[in-house]
């Protein structure tokens, strides 16, 4: 049994880090493998993560960490029984993937304006809270070509767009994701999408 693709890990910079790797053949990750992780410092306690399958030869592990802070560094040991398959290290604050925003809502009761709001996935005491920017993806369920991205570079978790920028009388979906430039993070996963029916009054044309 060998590791084909070494573990790569990302952290939500709060309490969960996720590591993924690939084995050289079909593997029952949860019964055959264990990922041990330990805070690098003195005699800190070692923790064990039981991986799950992620495709035939792929494994994923969700590492629960006690309040990740910037000085934390972890050693990672991947074991198959008594055999050490791989040894590495991981600094959560240098491999941040933010949590996905939540509670995406489309408010259609503002005259001819769509107001999209969502929740910041971090509490105010977390450094990322004031450093997230967002991308909002809106697409038509009827027309795959009608697909757009709005970059929200201000801190407020909201976006206003004129309803008239979208087609009237059809259904749209929206989703949002986040990233933080200050930590050069990757993008978060997309939030669950929300659906609405876009309708607005066409401006009266005089001839």
């Amino acid at each position: 049994m060998k590791v084909l693709q070494e573990p790569t890990c990302v952290s939500d910079y709060m309490s969960i880090s996720t590591c993924e790797w690939k084995m050289n053949g079909p593997t029952n990750c949860s019964t055959e493998l264990r990922l041990l992780y330990q805070l690098v410092f003195l005699l800190s306690e070692a923790h064990t993560c039981i991986p799950e399958n992620n495709g035939g030869a792929g494994c994923v592990c969700h590492l629960l960490m006690d309040d990740v802070v910037s000085a934390d560094n972890y050693t990672l040991d991947l074991w198959a029984g008594q055999q050490l398959l791989w040894k590495g290290s991981f600094k959560p604050s240098e491999h941040v993937k933010p949590r996905a925003p939540g509670n995406l809502t489309v408010h259609t009761n503002v005259s001819d304006t769509l107001l999209l709001t969502w929740s910041n996935p971090y509490p105010p005491d977390n450094y990322l809270y004031n450093h997230l920017t967002y991308a909002v993806n809106i697409w038509s369920e009827n027309d795959p070509a009608d697909f757009r991205i709005y970059n929200v570079t201000y801190l407020e978790p909201s976006l206003r767009i004129a309803a008239s920028t979208l087609k009237s009388g059809i259904s749209y979906r929206a989703r949002v994701r986040a990233w933080a430039q200050c930590y050069n993070t990757t993008w978060s996963e997309w939030s669950p999408s929300t659906k609405w029916h876009n309708s607005y009054r066409e401006p009266f044309e005089q001839h």
Epitope: Y13, M14, L39, V40, F41, L42, S44, D66, D67, V68, V69, S70, A71, D72, N73, S93, E94, P123, D125, N126, Y127, L128, C182
Partner: antibody, heavy 121, light 107 residues
Framework: QVQLQESGGGLVQPGGSLRLSCAAS????????LTWVRQAPGKGLEWVST????????LYADSVKDRFTISRDNAKNTLYLQMNSLKPEDTAVYYC??????????????WGQGTTVTVSS | DIQMTQSPSSLSASLGDRVTITCQAS??????LAWYQQKSGQAPKLLIY???RLQTGVPSRFSGSGSGTSFTLTISGLETEDLATYYC?????????FGQGTKLEIK
Amino acid sequence: QVQLQESGGGLVQPGGSLRLSCAASGFTFSSYSLTWVRQAPGKGLEWVSTIKARGGTTLYADSVKDRFTISRDNAKNTLYLQMNSLKPEDTAVYYCAKPLYSNLAGDFGSWGQGTTVTVSS
Amino acid sequence: DIQMTQSPSSLSASLGDRVTITCQASQSISSYLAWYQQKSGQAPKLLIYGGSRLQTGVPSRFSGSGSGTSFTLTISGLETEDLATYYCLQVYSWPLTFGQGTKLEIK
């Protein structure tokens, strides 16, 4: 506003014990890691110990490990430092410190006024 | 452990001068560095974090720069109230380690 108030310092003989307390207010105590930093007379700052927010992880400088124990009571908003087997070189002003954000380690935006520990026979 | 070497250990400057204090890390710490000011008989005060981010309420004459192993604190126009000892602190890894301090005196 954030307030940190240390207490429990005093004069103790070598080999003796003391327990320092740091009463906190003005922030969500249970969300932050908290730290003790000390300063010997006329010397620089030295990191002593940190306890993470939920109290499951404690970290110590080599100079105090196995002698000092950091703990916290999130219900009482209080941080503690139990100091045993004290040595003359532990003589210092002891500060408790809170980081600016819950996931920063040593970016201490708030400090107590300090409590003095003197170890002498 | 990461060693932090601060220089100079003391310096004397005139009001209005531009003052620079440097901190050298024994290994790369990216931008995981904070600067503190400590006046006599007082607790330290955070000036800069993240290598270059100015803490709220700190005068803009203070600035921090550098990354990796070399960092600088600059005071661009020294004022009487800046008489203090300045410390750098690496927050890249445990144990956290301070520089030995720079005592700033006014000529």
